[in-house]
C-alpha cells in the first residue's frame, strides 16, 4: 500500500514537472506580414489560436523569451509561395532564407543560431511556385534570452499556420 502511495506521488511529481516544462509553438500572423525583399524581422506571431500554444515562456515584441535556464530544442519552418493571381515577380532570381537569432539583454549581443534556405529561379512561365525551409537544433538558453525569426522576401511567405511557424521546448536542465 505504501509503495502504491509512493508511486502515485512520484507520478504526480513527474507529471507536474512535465507540465512546468517550458514550450512554445508560434504561428505566423498573416494579417501583419511585413514587406521587403531584404532580410526583415518577423514580429507578429500567434501564441494562443489554432495550433499555436505557449507555456512557461513569454512572447513579447515579436520575440520568444526564455523564462527558465535549460537546454532547448528550437525549430522553425518557413514556406514561401507565389501564385500568378497575386501578380508577377519583379525578379525571377530569389534568395529565400530564414535566420533564427538569439539576443541576450544582460550582455547585449545577438547571434544567429540557425539559418537555412536557398537561391531559387522562379520562372515567370510557371503559374505556381513553392519552397519550404525547416531548421532545428539543440541550444543552451538562459532566462531572459530572446529568440526571433528573420526572413528574406516576406511578401512571399505562405501565411498558413501549418506552413510558417517556429517553436521551442525545454529538454533538460543545465547541470
Amino acid at each position: 500500500e505504501k509503495a502504491m502511495v509512493d508511486g502515485s506521488w512520484l507520478d504526480l511529481a513527474k507529471r507536474s514537472k512535465l507540465e512546468a516544462q517550458p514550450f512554445a509553438h508560434l504561428t505566423i500572423n498573416a494579417t501583419d506580414i511585413p514587406s521587403g525583399s531584404h532580410k526583415v524581422s518577423l514580429s507578429s506571431w500567434y501564441h494562443d489560436r489554432g495550433w499555436a500554444k505557449i507555456s512557461n515562456m513569454t512572447f513579447s515584441n515579436g520575440k520568444l523569451i526564455v523564462n527558465q535556464d535549460g537546454f532547448y530544442y528550437l525549430y522553425a519552418n518557413i514556406c514561401f509561395r507565389h501564385h500568378e493571381t497575386s501578380g508577377d515577380l519583379a525578379t525571377e532570381y530569389l534568395q529565400l532564407m530564414v535566420y533564427v537569432t538569439k539576443t541576450s539583454i544582460k550582455i547585449p549581443s545577438s547571434h544567429t543560431l540557425m539559418k537555412g534556405g536557398s537561391t531559387k529561379y522562379w520562372s515567370g512561365n510557371s503559374e505556381f511556385h513553392f519552397y519550404s525551409i525547416n531548421v532545428g537544433g539543440f541550444f543552451k538558453l538562459r532566462s531572459g534570452e530572446e529568440i526571433s525569426i528573420e526572413v528574406s522576401n516576406p511578401s512571399l511567405l505562405d501565411p498558413d499556420q501549418d506552413a510558417t511557424y517556429f517553436g521551442a521546448f525545454k529538454v533538460r536542465d543545465i547541470d
Epitope: 514587406s35 508577377d88 525578379t91 522576401n153
Partner: antibody, heavy 126, light 103 residues
Framework: QVQLVQSGAEVRKPGASVKVSCKAS????????IHWVRQAPGQRLEWMGW????????KFSQKFQGRITVTRDTAASTAYMELRSLRSEDTAVYYC???????????????????WGQGTLVTVSS | EIVMTQSPSSLSASVGDRVTITCRAS??????LNWYQLKPGKAPRLLIY???SLQSGVPSRFSGSGSGAEFTLTISSLQPEDIATYYC?????FGQGTKVEIK
C-alpha cells in the same frame, strides 16, 4: 506630388515605329515598376507590358511580344515604350502607369496602377 | 488566360441614385481586383484596389465588394462628376467597361 508626364501625340505610317516617353517625378523612380496600357477607339483597356525601373526586368503581353521594347533611364526618371511594325489597329491612346507596391518593400508587381500619365495618342495611317 | 466580364455595358441613372456595376472573372482571383474611372481626355484614376480598399483621395460614396469570381462597384449617391466609364481589372486583364450617364 507624384506625376507621370508623357510625350505628345504621334502620327505614323503602317510599318513604321513609335517611341513614347513617360517622365516620372515626385517619387523614387527606381523603387517602382512602370506599366504600359493602351486603349484603341471603342475598345477596352489593354495591358502591354511592364518594366521594373530598379533592375530593368521586363514582361510583355504575348500579343506584343517581338515588336515591343520597354526601356528606362534612371538618371532621367523616364520610361520608354517603343512599338515596331505599326498597323492601323495600333491606333490608340497609350498610357504609362505606376505600379503601387514599392519594390523596396516587396517583390511582387501587383498590377494596381495608382498614378497614370495623361496618355499619348498614336495614329497609324497611310 | 483570365477573362473579365462587366455588366451592364452602359447605364443611365439620376443624380443621387445608387449605382451598382458587376464584374465577373472566368476563374477565382481571390480579392485581386481593382476598379478604375476613365474620363475622356483625362488620365485614368484608381478607385478601389484589392476588391474593397478605397484608394486615398477617392470619395467615400465609392465602394467595392466581392471575392472569388464575382465583384461589385457601388456608387452610393451618383454625382454629376461621376459621369465616366468604369473598368474592373485583374493583373493583365480588364473588363470591357461600363459607361455611366446621367438621366
Amino acid at each position: 506630388q507624384v506625376q507621370l508626364v508623357q510625350s505628345g501625340a504621334e502620327v505614323r505610317k503602317p510599318g513604321a515605329s513609335v517611341k513614347v516617353s513617360c517622365k516620372a517625378s515626385g517619387y523614387d523612380f527606381s523603387n517602382y515598376a512602370i506599366h504600359w496600357v493602351r486603349q484603341a477607339p471603342g475598345q477596352r483597356l489593354e495591358w502591354m507590358g511592364w518594366i521594373n525601373a530598379g533592375n530593368g526586368n521586363t514582361k510583355f503581353s504575348q500579343k506584343f511580344q517581338g515588336r515591343i521594347t520597354v526601356t528606362r533611364d534612371t538618371a532621367a526618371s523616364t520610361a520608354y515604350m517603343e512599338l515596331r511594325s505599326l498597323r492601323s489597329e495600333d491606333t490608340a491612346v497609350y498610357y504609362c502607369a505606376r505600379d503601387s507596391p514599392n519594390m523596396v518593400r516587396g517583390i511582387i508587381i501587383a498590377y494596381y496602377f495608382d498614378y497614370w500619365g495623361q496618355g499619348t495618342l498614336v495614329t497609324v495611317s497611310s | 488566360e483570365i477573362v473579365m466580364t462587366q455588366s451592364p455595358s452602359s447605364l443611365s441613372a439620376s443624380v443621387g441614385d445608387r449605382v451598382t456595376i458587376t464584374c465577373r472573372a472566368s476563374q477565382s482571383i481571390s480579392r485581386y481586383l481593382n476598379w478604375y474611372q476613365l474620363k475622356p481626355g483625362k488620365a485614368p484614376r484608381l478607385l478601389i484596389y484589392g476588391a474593397s480598399s478605397l484608394q486615398s483621395g477617392v470619395p467615400s460614396r465609392f465602394s467595392g465588394s466581392g471575392s472569388g469570381a464575382e465583384f461589385t462597384l457601388t456608387i452610393s449617391s451618383l454625382q454629376p462628376e461621376d459621369i465616366a466609364t468604369y473598368y474592373c481589372q485583374h493583373t493583365r486583364a480588364f473588363g470591357q467597361g461600363t459607361k455611366v450617364e446621367i438621366k
